[in-house]
Amino acid sequence: MRRGPRSLRGRDAPAPTPCVPAECFDLLVRHCVACGLLRTPRPKPAGASSPAPRTALQPQESVGAGAGEAALPLPGLL
């Protein structure tokens, strides 16, 4: 599987609003949501037979043509 964009950097934004214990603050939608799956299962380690998708927290080159770094508004992330 081809590598997707994962070079994300945070931007200045208001502090996350407090969530009830059963919820987590989603850094993209900026709302409290059900925490759901805790840490998506890691792809196979390097050296596996087929290239696995990487996760958002792993460094990667920019995907956009001419873009220095792909950016998503993720306050507090990275």
Partner: nanobody, 121 residues
Framework: EVQLVESGGGVVQPGRSLRLTCAAS????????MYWIRQAPGKGLEWVSY????????YYADSVKGRFTISRDNSKNTLYLQMNSLRAEDTAVYYC??????????????WGQGTTVTVSS
Amino acid sequence: EVQLVESGGGVVQPGRSLRLTCAASGFTFSTSGMYWIRQAPGKGLEWVSYISSSSSTIYYADSVKGRFTISRDNSKNTLYLQMNSLRAEDTAVYYCVTQSCGAGKCYPGVWGQGTTVTVSS
């Protein structure tokens, strides 16, 4: 192995519709929130929509609100994005992305390979 495979992209005229599909495998899809995130040519990433594991919570970016509809079928491990009234500015690579949570926060997890949508007359 976690796998997300998007399909349904293509070239479409402004005002028309497309439906994107994301086939998920290798993890418990039914308990994972999911995002659609896009990247226009030469631009940064833009969050499009979010759906919770049970479809009870749905959010849209302002730029697509009222035009795009996110949905999922947990029995088929599939995520969808129905895109109506498409505009030239919707031209982008669309990625299906898992939601990962920890330490009281959620954020993008694993990304698919993307499917390209081109809106052009």
